[in-house]
Interface confidence: medium
């Protein structure tokens, strides 16, 4: 599915994946374990969560979001190094909050260009854009503080507690449902 969120590929170069296995469909395998894993989605050009059964499957499976991004997104490590070395923020840091269209309630972080800080938001579990980080630290490292230096302080504590419903929440029904992938 095409996702166009004013998201240019200039920072991440060509959208051709780094390895052929990154183009494989997510494969949970035949076993029945419930292991949260990550795969590279060729259609959204993002690393996304899925539930791995614990056996078989394929190489497009990673234990962490970061590992998936490093392995499958062209130029990702270069972008991260560039950010850490004080160069400008990657383009995707300026994308607006996008919870996607699904109804999962995943706690994620995004860079808010208005406040110039990483903030918590609720991700629905599918689609969305690349301004979406699993940890506050990863968001800060890439988008908030690309020149390095230490974050910390009270703001981090308050930020970690702040959670608000945004577009993609359940405005009519107020049914709280949680996805585990």
């Amino acid at each position: 599915l095409s996702e166009e969120a004013d998201d240019t590929d200039s920072e991440l170069g060509s959208m051709k994946p780094l390895h052929t296995f990154c183009a494989m469909k997510a494969d949970d395998g035949p076993c029945k374990a419930m292991i949260r894993s990550y795969f590279f989605n060729m259609y959204t050009h993002q690393c996304e969560e899925f539930i791995y059964g614990g056996c078989e499957g394929n190489e497009n499976r990673f234990d962490t979001l970061e590992e998936c991004k490093k392995t499958c997104i062209p130029g990702y490590e270069k972008t991260a190094v560039k950010a850490a070395s004080g160069a400008e923020r990657p383009d995707f840091c300026f994308l607006e909050e996008d919870p996607g269209l699904c109804r999962g309630y995943m706690k994620r972080y995004l860079y808010n260009n208005q406040t110039k800080q990483c903030e918590r938001f609720v991700y629905g579990g599918c689609l969305g854009n690349r301004n979406n980080f699993e940890t506050l630290d990863e968001c800060k490292k890439i988008c908030e503080n690309p020149g390095g230096g230490s974050g910390g302080g009270l703001n981090d504590i308050f930020e970690a507690q702040k959670i608000e419903w945004h577009e993609g929440g359940p405005p009519h029904h107020h049914h709280h449902h949680h996805h585990h992938h």
């Epitope: 969120a5 269209l101 699904c102 109804r103 599918c126 049914h175 585990h180």
Partner: antibody, heavy 118, light 113 residues
């Protein structure tokens, strides 16, 4: 009361263009993602495209990618679907719907018929 | 060919209980994505019947209930009434497709008598 009213359908030749509109009322339009879903005569439902509340993110089914463009004007409470390079297989009733419960479409318009034929 | 598979038709007598099945795969229902159900009465737009697997919007009678288990989902209608005659569609998200919001092919429910 939530109301969604589609317009702009009609008969068009293959290769031609049409722009559908969906006028929304009865809810805070800018707070909701919106979708277009179509139904070919006598067939099932097919999701076409969606757009986030602010309009910053758009999504398309493969069958229309590169030919259709979804947009919205929140000041006018209106959703649009610009359809170019139309094909016979695009013939359908086009519904606009609001993503009230995100992946669920809470409210639907009455639909507007698009016929692509020479 | 729809990503989610439904029986094309079902029938039941008034007062009976009918169940409409929706079978998916590990990339949609089996990946813990919600299923929704829509009712489409003849000549009208679809109407949301069940969202988030088993939740009814206000105004939908409790004769309608939904469930999801593994790669399958079902819609149960108890105390079948003449006005339930309609097409019913299941819908979910599929992470392996580019057209990610997916529907079943629809089930035409006929109320006998």
């Amino acid at each position: 009361e939530v109301q969604l009213v589609e317009s702009g359908g009609g008969l068009v030749q293959p290769g031609g263009s049409l722009r559908l509109s969906c006028a929304a009322s009865g809810f805070t339009f800018s707070s909701y993602a919106m979708s277009w879903v179509r139904q070919a005569p006598g067939k099932g439902l097919e999701w076409v495209s969606a757009i986030s509340g602010s309009g910053g993110s758009t999504y398309y089914a493969d069958s229309v990618k590169g030919r259709f463009t979804i947009s919205r004007d929140n000041s006018k409470n209106t959703l649009y679907l610009q359809m170019n390079s139309l094909r016979a297989e695009d013939t359908a009733v086009y519904y606009c719907a609001n993503n009230g419960a995100a992946a669920a479409w809470d409210y639907w318009g009455q639909g507007t018929l698009v016929t692509v034929s020479s | 060919q729809s990503v989610l598979t439904q029986p094309p038709s079902l029938s039941g007598a008034p007062g009976q209980r009918v169940t409409i099945s929706c079978t998916g795969s590990s990339s949609n229902l089996g990946a813990d994505y919600d299923v929704q159900w829509y009712q489409q009465l003849p000549g009208t737009a679809p109407k949301l019947l069940i969202f988030g697997n088993n939740n009814r919007p206000s105004g939908v009678p409790d004769r309608f209930s939904g469930s999801r288990s593994g790669t399958s989902a079902s819609l149960a209608i108890t105390g079948l009434q003449a006005e339930d005659e309609a097409n019913y569609y299941c819908q979910s998200y599929d992470r392996s497709l580019s057209g990610s919001m997916v529907f079943g092919g629809g089930t035409k429910l006929t109320v006998l008598g």
